[in-house]
């Protein structure tokens, strides 16, 4: 009789290659009835949580994670997780940023739109039946900035 | 094994203040609700409040300017309670987001 | 206000028959964030089902939940003399408020 939670997904706007100084959002998305959001680095341990989770559709609730100034630390992995209480979601495929030096403005050509990794069929390696991320590290405010306040 | 246990119920005078702890052993209570609810003798169950893994406070209307919940570290929540009464005498309970219990610590108001 | 009301105390059935508590809120709760727990004297309470209708790990599938929206619904059938305890029901609202009903007795005769 466990319901299973889907997958999250993951998108990020405008896109996932991003020129230095430019913003970029993350948008995680998950079921109804979602509490909280948390976006990873790779490292579990690095992340960012918001309640700021809105309704995308009648099916589907959302966050949204925005870098306000992407600089060449905020390049690499990320993925999405979600707790809809009791338990935690498995987490989404990793999103790869890049971060390109300028060559031309924020709206440069080559700046990809809207690429996202969404759920797939295999199954993830941690089974979060437990439903906790194995991380007990503290949130990293000094790598994601959003609206929310922590 | 996962637990929680309260700490800090005492007999209290009206008008006074206390400070309750929930101790977690074997999770990190940043990645769950850490809810408080109540329970005055004889009486029914009554949710206070919860902190959640964002470290937002989320609490009942009745609560509001009374009730602080706050963390304290990755394995403890407090809750601050202030301006008490009578009608405050309770067992009080925290939960891990509502499958795991501690066993209660007892207020007490009185002169 | 929201209320949750729960069936009146007490409810009394006999070892091996079937119970049914209900509760109703005054407004829908959200995304099926329904909860029951059963409380014996002395103890915390002990979650037996949530979303509604999903049972806690451990709890005898003698136990299950139903409803929606307003309407929901605890049934324990093959009662043991172990089931006598008070039965609350708890709702989830938009907000991340909850709030538990009265709590309804079960004797088992």
């Known amino acids: 009789q466990e319901e299973d939670l889907p997958r999250p997904s993951i998108s990020a706007e405008p896109g996932t290659v991003i020129p230095l100084g430019s913003h970029v959002t993350f948008v995680c998305r998950g079921p109804v009835g979602v509490q909280t959001f948390r976006l990873e680095r790779e490292s579990r341990s690095t992340y960012n949580d918001t309640e700021d989770v809105s309704q995308a559709s009648p099916s589907e609730s959302e966050a949204r994670f925005r870098i306000d100034s992407v600089s060449e630390g905020n390049a690499g992995p990320y993925r999405c997780i979600y707790y809809k209480p009791p338990k935690w979601s498995e987490q989404s495929d990793y999103l790869e940023l890049l971060v390109k030096e300028t060559s031309g403005g924020p709206d440069s050509p080559d700046t990809e739109p809207g690429s996202s990794a969404g759920p797939t069929q295999r199954p993830s390696d941690n089974s979060h039946n437990e439903h906790a991320p194995a991380s007990q590290g503290l949130k990293a405010e000094h790598l994601y900035h959003h609206h929310h306040h922590h | 094994e996962q637990s929680l246990k309260e700490s800090g119920g005492r007999l209290v005078t009206p008008g006074g203040s206390l400070t309750l702890t929930c101790t977690a052993s074997?999770?990190?209570?940043?990645?769950?609700?850490i809810q408080w609810v109540r329970q005055a003798p004889g009486k029914g169950l009554e949710w206070i409040g919860f902190?959640?893994?964002?470290?937002?406070e989320y609490s009942a209307t009745w609560a509001k300017g009374r009730f602080t919940i706050y963390k304290t570290s990755s394995t403890t929540v407090e809750l601050k309670m202030t301006s008490l009464t009578a009608s405050d005498t309770a067992t009080y309970f925290c939960?891990?987001?509502?499958?795991?219990w501690g066993p209660g610590t007892l207020v007490t108001i009185s002169s | 206000e929201l209320v949750m009301t729960q069936t009146e105390s007490p409810v009394s059935a006999a070892v091996g028959g079937t119970v049914t508590i209900s509760c109703q809120s005054s407004?829908?709760?959200?995304?099926?964030?329904l909860s029951w727990f059963q409380q014996k004297p002395g103890q915390p309470p002990k979650e037996l089902v949530y979303?509604?209708?999903t049972l806690q790990s451990g709890v005898p599938s003698r136990f299950s939940g139903s409803g929606s929206g307003t309407q929901f619904t605890l049934t324990i059938s093959d009662l043991e003399c172990d089931d006598a305890a008070t039965y609350y029901c708890?709702?989830?609202?938009?907000?991340?408020?909850?709030?538990f009903g009265g709590g309804t007795e079960v004797e088992i005769k």
């Open positions: 902190i959640s893994p964002a470290g937002n």
């Open positions: 939960a891990r987001h509502w499958d795991s």
């Open positions: 708890l709702g989830g609202y938009s907000g991340n408020i909850y709030v």
């Open positions: 407004q829908s709760v959200y995304s099926n964030r």
């Open positions: 074997g999770f990190d209570i940043n990645n769950y609700n």
């Open positions: 979303w509604t209708s």
